[in-house]
């Protein structure tokens, strides 16, 4: 057959469906490699085959749409399993093509079970609440376009293994899962299941995210650098290791970069000729405030660096601070004899 | 479409205990709790609790704890409830029945096996 | 345990005749709940669940609503393969649990 533009295996789009239940899933084409939507090349006399290949199988094999029941089917760019089976795992391909043109893209497919509890392999989005905020909501994910608005879907919620009923501060609405006041007891994994009829069958669609409860943007402060302060003074003699801690507190924020560096007389450590490491740690709050140290040793220190200006400082979304520590050079200790005897006049 | 076979009847000796099936076809059985149900002569139903066939987790009604044991045979697609300590107050009609996660109940019934306990 | 009371145990009515079963539920159920239609050979069918939807293949003369802590399943025009026996069931929490049946009889 004659040339085909391959996109290869999109690893991206890593496909995860739960067992026996419906699934739909659109070309990628469309959406990530051409320009042009399924509309559009319908319409220019393109076709768009699918085909895919078993796990553990090299041969690729053209999909079966005469199943009982229609199980897999295809309509426009997507195709859609009513329901899923485990053995539906595979590499799946959509191909494009007409007489003159041919676009193809794999993608990675895997069926996973899940357990009486909803745990499973399945890769869980992470949706954040803020601490103590008010109403806050999620809602049941990827369920667009599986059953047409005119049905009325039943929609169950659970946390973890158990059915939400009678909880205190959390309330399902419908496809919304409300909570009334957000704490860190609300950490966890919450799953709706959504029932819906389809010419006389019934099936159902499970979907689980994990909520983390996180600080509120209302108690959010400016970075908070803890160390170096006033009250420590980092007194060395030449030859010995200088190690200064920076320390610092940032408050969660929605995607805030958190940045901690080091300047030495206004500069950055890579910039002066001075053999300087620097060692980062990052610990996190329960609500996900951020705690980063950075140690800056010099592991011989000379009288030079001892006169230097050593500067922590910080910045995320709330602001920039920074703090210079206080280094000094020891004074060498008086030997007995010579000096304290000089200074009582002994000759 | 789905089915839920049972066998008809069960004649058991007080003291002893019996092993009842629910062969599953139909639907994916590892998908879907197994529910057992009770119905005395002439009385209501009463749940006594139910299976999940993937990882045999199980939840019990507190007053059939000690009197039943459900198990899973995925091979072959069968749900089991063992009855122990036969009395005449288990004799019964026992149903099994499927439901998806208790979101929307028992959706699927077998016919029901009819145990006598009678020496 | 979440007591199911369900009313009136017996009922009789004639053909074409508009009937409702009610359940009380002692808690809060959230709607968790199915109605259950049992034949006199013993079969179970299940008629409506999460309070108010009718099950596929069940006739449109079945209906489920609610109003506060009551449940109720109405018949809006009695057939004959009707007659039965009719229970309630929720499924808010374990154990679940079943009103105590309503034996509808044709008069």
């Known amino acids: 057959s004659e040339r085909c533009d391959d996109w290869g295996l999109d690893t991206m789009r890593q496909i995860q469906v739960f067992e026996d239940e419906p699934a739909r899933i659109k070309c990628p084409l469309f959406e990530h490699f051409l320009k042009f939507n399924y509309s559009t090349a319908h319409s220019a006399g393109l076709t768009l085959i699918w085909y895919w290949t078993r796990q553990d199988r090299d041969l690729e094999e053209p999909i079966n749409f005469r199943l009982p029941e229609n199980r897999i089917s295809k309509e426009k760019d997507v195709l859609w399993f009513r329901p899923t089976l485990l053995n539906d795992t595979g590499n799946y391909t959509c191909m494009l093509r007409n007489t003159t043109y041919c676009s193809k893209v794999a993608f990675p497919l895997e069926v996973v079970q899940k357990d009486s509890c909803f745990n499973s392999p399945m890769k869980l989005p992470v949706h954040k609440l803020y601490i103590e905020y008010g109403i806050q909501r999620i809602t049941c994910p990827n369920v667009d376009g599986y059953f047409p608005s005119s049905v009325k879907p039943t929609i169950t919620w659970y946390m973890g293994c158990y059915k939400i009923q009678n909880f205190n501060n959390v309330i399902p609405e419908g496809m919304n899962l409300s909570f009334l006041i957000a704490l860190i007891s609300n950490n966890g994994n919450y799953t709706c299941v959504v029932t819906y009829p389809e010419n006389g069958r019934t099936f159902h669609l499970t979907r689980t995210l994990t909520v983390k409860v996180v600080g509120s943007p209302k108690n959010a402060v400016p970075p908070v650098i803890h160390s170096p302060n006033d009250h420590v003074v980092y007194e060395k003699e030449p030859g010995e290791e200088l190690l200064i801690p920076c320390t610092v507190y940032f408050s969660f924020l929605m995607d805030s970069r958190n940045e901690v560096w080091w300047t030495i007389d206004g500069k950055k450590p890579d910039d002066i000729t001075i053999d300087v490491t620097i060692n980062e740690s990052i610990s996190h709050s329960r609500t996900e405030d951020e705690t980063r140290t950075q140690i800056l040793s010099i592991k011989k220190v000379t009288s030079e660096d001892l006169k230097r200006s050593y500067v922590c400082h910080a910045r995320s979304a709330k602001g920039e601070v920074a703090k210079a520590a206080k280094v000094k050079q020891k004074v060498p200790a008086p030997r007995y004899t010579v000096e304290l005897a000089c200074g009582f006049g002994a000759t | 479409q789905v089915q839920l076979q049972q066998p008809g009847a069960e004649l058991v000796r007080p003291g002893s205990s019996v092993k009842l099936s629910c062969k599953a076809s139909?639907?994916?059985?590892?998908?879907?709790?197994m529910d057992w149900v009770k119905q005395r002569p002439g009385q209501g139903l009463e749940w006594i609790g139910n299976?999940?066939?993937?990882?045999?987790?199980?939840h019990y009604n507190q007053k059939f704890k000690d009197k039943a044991t459900l198990t899973i045979d995925k091979s072959s697609s069968t749900a089991y409830m063992q009855l122990s300590s036969l009395t005449s107050e288990d004799s019964a009609v026992y149903y099994c029945a499927r439901d998806y996660y208790g979101s929307i109940g028992m959706d699927s019934w077998g016919q029901g096996t009819s145990v006598t306990v009678s020496s | 345990d979440i007591q199911m009371t369900q009313s009136p145990s017996s009922l009789s009515a004639s053909l074409g005749e508009r009937v409702s079963l009610t359940c009380r539920a002692s808690?809060?159920?959230?709607?968790?709940l199915s109605w259950l239609q049992q034949k006199p050979d013993g079969t179970i069918k299940r008629l409506i669940y999460a309070a108010s939807t009718l099950d596929s293949g069940v006739p449109k003369r079945f209906s489920g609503s609610r109003s506060g802590s009551d449940y109720s399943l109405t018949i809006s025009s009695l057939e004959s393969e009707d007659f039965a026996d009719y229970y309630c069931?929720?499924?808010?929490?374990?154990?679940?649990?079943f009103g105590g049946g309503t034996k509808l009889e044709i008069k």
């Open positions: 139909g639907y994916t059985f590892t998908s879907y709790w």
């Open positions: 808690q809060e159920i959230s709607d968790y």
């Open positions: 299976i999940y066939p993937s990882d045999s987790a199980t």
């Open positions: 069931l929720q499924y808010a929490s374990f154990p679940w649990t």
